[in-house]
């Protein structure tokens, strides 16, 4: 605790103190006050700079004295060998004594008490701003008049804050403008305008003299303006060193005005103003602002429309424009909405065919798609080159968005087909030479593949069995080749209206219009062992002339069994129609002239013995075509005969290439549209 | 009408091995793919592995590889079959069957040769 | 291998009744399934092709049914001749794999 005064006595005092004994002391008296401390008697042992006995007084970090030897009073009248006088409420004594003394000492005696200290003009640094006034145990401030002590109760200022301006125009001044503003204030003003205007300072350079910076160029005296994040200054110095003109992008302004103690200038004035808070003209790429304008400010609105191939995306829906309003805090509304370029995405698939994966599928992008060649081509032209377009679609110079249709191509065996041994008559043959070749299991029989969906045979093998199997890509009809080829199943039979269909269809001698299509339940894919023969055209070019070569295969009757295991096929002549006249029916069931012969009918055959026979029904007859000689087409199909190893009738296919066409867009699904 | 006409029945120890022979008449064997089937007395029937023209390969039921070796001789029309290592257990009538068209899975039989394996 | 498993493996029934044997396969064998006959000391003779195929001089009361994994054989009406051990067969895929046999005796 704290004492008004108090007495140190070394130990044993006032017998010898004992050696190698270190004490101190801790006095302490009263804030406020001073500490004044004295010695009435002093014999410790002499040494230089009290090396070996000493007492020590302390003040803070600073050594007031070191005491050692013996001391007398000079004044007569008073018992004080030695004392000390400090301005704080604090101070420690320390007494040491070596480890040996060569005469007896008896030590010292001293006194300590407080005392006042003037803090008004004990001191280096004045402790009140203007009036100090001490007194016994402390001191206090006072002020001017219109001055007012701060919080701090040491420093007077002038009141000068507190002022806020909400009107949208104003003039604010330093206090006692153009007379000297106080010293060591701190003045705010604050502007507070309606949300969407913003504070605009004006100043003229005359109208500001803020006492000049330091020399490391630090504002002694200094005006600041803070807009929310934003600081403009701080200022000083004779003559407005600012922008004579602030615009603040707020509409809350603080204007700060700190003054020091000294050097005391004329100040400032200043005017203001709300502006509509102004929106910058953005860059916003790829876009163009409707309408168009220098300066935009609060509560402008603008159309931002995307320029062609771009968008607005906006979760997962796109707008080619959106509109933006400049906002209050003077920041447009949507900022964040951009006009990126269109993405048409991954581009669709085509059956039968390929498009390769895009590098980017933004707008401008291109891409090609190809179709599985040489087995499918693209129907629809266009060349398959795709760009991404404004709308967001893959577009073609041809076909618009239309998707590239492949389609198969017709009438390109893989192989051609070459005759060998003679075997009726006709030759071992691969189903990469007659890809189109369909078999019929029940009955044994064939067809001719004419596209994806549609197999064309006779009438004849079809009319029994409106469900019957089919086979494509094998060249064998052994069981084990079947189980490995495609088996297509049908969805509907047509024969065509003008066959006759009989109750007892063995004793048939009229074998007019035998012809019809069976439509397949999917799609037949196409590669080297299975692809459609090509349809006649309707031009004289595809009417048939005798001696005219065309090609039959199939798995039916040969010399040595009664159906062939591997695919045969013979190269034979058309031949004029009364060859097949002449010929004796082998087996006949009726009369021989009551078999039909009609200008739907071809005759071929007749040479070498090469024919077709029981169990080729159906099959093709494949005539190159005049106007593209890669290609084969089915001029006929394997209807009846006379005798095999003669000639052959044959249904003229041209003759119903108008119906085959109706028949099957009549019967098409959407996909195939 | 096609017809086979297996070699006769055989006696053999265990660990030796067998060849049965099938001569095709009414058809030539490069027409044809023969099968073989076997059947144990009292049991069922067991298929052994055929050779396939198309791909010009014997193909062996997973059981018999190794042990069994099919051949054909074009000039004769004659097939054979040799199965080797002979156990007990193989004893059982040996059928050459020719395989069928349009689904039919086989359309002419040999009339059986029946090997007996005994000590 | 794909496995072929027929039940019953022994039936017993008069003449007149209809009968019928299951066949099961381990995968999916499409139609690729046929039917035999097999009579002591002969060679088995075919019956159905193709699941449900009548070979030709088969009678009529043999039929079949069923594809992928199912498969029936249904005899209308039982006659004396008919008393045999019947066989399914697969022929989808090598191997090709038999049943073990139904053996229909008189009851």
């Known amino acids: 605790e704290p004492t008004m005064y108090g007495e140190i006595l070394s130990p044993n005092y006032p017998q010898a103190y004992p050696s190698e004994v270190e004490k101190s002391w801790d006095i302490e008296v009263p804030e406020g006050y001073g500490i004044h401390l004295y010695f009435t008697h002093l014999d410790i042992e002499l040494s230089e700079n009290c090396a070996y006995d000493s007492v020590q007084i302390i003040s803070g970090d600073t050594e007031e004295g070191r005491l050692c030897g013996q001391r007398s009073s000079n004044n007569p009248h008073s018992p004080i060998v030695e004392e000390f006088q400090v301005p704080y409420n604090k101070l420690q004594v320390i007494f040491k004594s070596d480890f040996s003394n060569e005469e007896r000492f008896t030590g010292f005696a001293a006194y300590y008490v407080a005392t006042d200290i003037n803090e008004c003009t004990d001191f280096v640094d004045v402790p009140c701003s203007h009036f100090c006034n001490n007194f016994i145990g402390g001191y206090f401030c006072s002020c001017p008049p219109e001055y007012f002590l701060h919080d701090d109760m040491k420093n007077c200022g002038v009141n000068c804050s507190g002022d806020v301006f909400t009107a949208l125009i104003g003039e604010i001044a330093s206090p006692n403008y153009p007379k000297p503003y106080p010293e060591n204030s701190r003045c705010e003003y604050q502007i507070r305008l309606e949300k969407g205007f913003q504070v605009v300072v004006t100043l003229r350079r005359e109208d500001f003299d803020v006492e000049a910076a330091d020399s490391a160029g630090n504002c002694l005296d200094s005006l600041v303006f803070v807009a929310g994040d934003r600081q403009f200054g701080p200022y000083c110095g004779h003559g407005f060193p600012g922008p004579l003109n602030i615009e603040t992008k707020s509409n809350a302004l603080d204007i700060i005005f700190q003054t020091d103690l000294t050097g005391q200038k004329k100040g400032w004035k200043l005017r203001y103003h709300g502006d509509p808070m102004p929106c910058p003209k953005e860059d916003t790429p790829n876009s163009v602002w409707e309408p168009a304008k220098a300066k935009y400010v609060f509560r402008d609105v603008v159309q931002i429309t995307c320029l062609d191939g771009f968008e607005v995306v906006e979760g997962r829906v796109g707008a080619t424009s959106f509109y933006s309003t400049c906002q209050s805090n003077g920041k447009w509304s949507n900022s964040k909405l951009k006009c990126q370029p269109v993405d048409c995405g991954i581009p669709e698939s085509i059956e039968n065919g390929k498009v390769e994966d895009p590098e980017s599928t933004l707008f401008g992008s291109v891409i090609r798609y190809t179709c599985e060649e040489p087995y499918y081509y693209m129907e629809n032209g266009g060349g398959g080159e795709y760009h991404c377009a404004g709308n967001g679609s893959w577009v073609n110079e041809v076909l618009g968005p239309e998707l590239p249709k492949c389609v198969p191509v017709c009438g390109v065996p893989r192989e051609p087909f070459e005759e060998k041994q003679r075997i009726i008559g006709g030759s071992d043959a691969d189903i990469k030479n007659f890809p189109w070749q369909v078999f019929f299991d029940n009955p044994w029989a064939g067809g001719a593949l004419i596209n994806e969906y549609w197999v064309l045979t006779a009438a004849h093998v079809v009319e029994g069995n409106r469900e019957p199997t089919m086979y494509v890509g094998s060249t064998s009809v052994q069981t084990s080749r079947l189980a490995k080829s495609k088996m297509l199943t049908p969805e509907h039979v047509f024969i065509h209206p003008g066959w006759k269909l009989l109750e007892v269809p063995e004793g048939r001698t009229n074998f007019d219009n035998d012809i019809a299509l069976v439509r397949l339940k999917d799609p037949v894919k196409m590669g080297p062992t299975v692809s459609p023969i090509c349809l006649p055209g309707t031009s004289s070019d595809y009417n048939l002339m005798d001696g005219d070569l065309g090609l039959i295969s199939g798995w039916g009757r040969t010399e040595k069994r009664d159906r062939a295991v591997r695919l045969k096929a013979a190269r034979l002549p058309v031949a004029p129609l009364r060859k097949c006249k002449e010929v004796k029916v082998e087996k006949p069931t009726a009369d021989a002239e009551a078999y039909v012969f009609t200008p739907n009918m071809i005759c071929a055959g007749g040479e070498k013995g090469m024919d077709s026979c029981k169990g080729d029904s159906g099959g093709a007859f494949a005539v190159q075509d005049p106007n593209d000689k890669t290609k084969f087409y089915a001029a006929g199909l394997v209807s009846w005969g006379p005798q095999c190893g003669t000639y052959g009738l044959y249904t003229r296919v041209k003759n119903y290439v108008d119906w085959i066409m109706k028949t099957m867009q009549e019967n098409s699904t959407p996909r195939e549209d | 009408e096609v017809q086979l006409v297996q070699s006769g029945a055989e006696v053999k120890k265990p660990g030796a091995s067998v060849k049965v022979s099938c001569k095709v008449s009414g058809d030539t064997l490069t027409e044809l793919s023969m099968h073989w089937v076997r059947q144990a007395p009292g049991k069922g029937l067991e298929w052994m592995g055929t050779?396939?023209?198309?791909?010009?390969?014997?193909i062996y039921a997973q059981k018999f590889q190794g042990r069994v070796t099919m051949t054909e001789d074009t000039s004769t029309d004659t097939a054979y079959m040799e199965l080797s290592s002979l156990r007990s257990e193989d004893t059982a009538v040996y059928y050459c069957?020719?395989?069928?068209?349009?689904?039919?899975?086989?359309?002419?039989w040999g009339q059986g040769t029946l090997v007996t394996v005994s000590s | 291998d794909i496995q072929m498993t027929q039940s019953p493996s022994t039936l017993s029934a008069s003449v007149g009744d209809r009968v019928t044997i299951t066949c099961r396969a381990s995968q999916s064998i499409s139609s690729w399934l046929a039917w035999y006959q097999q009579k002591p000391g002969k060679a088995p003779k075919l019956l159905i092709y193709k699941a449900s195929s009548l070979e030709s001089g088969v009678p009529s009361r043999f039929s079949g049914s069923g594809s992928g994994t199912e498969f029936t054989l249904t005899i209308s009406s039982l006659q004396p001749d008919d008393f045999a051990t019947y066989y399914c067969?697969?022929?989808?895929?090598?191997?090709?794999?038999f049943g073990q046999g139904t053996k229909v005796e008189i009851k």
């Open positions: 067969q697969q022929v989808n895929s090598y191997d090709w794999t």
């Open positions: 069957v020719t395989e069928g068209l349009g689904g039919r899975p086989f359309d002419h």
């Open positions: 050779f396939d023209p198309e791909e010009g390969e014997t």
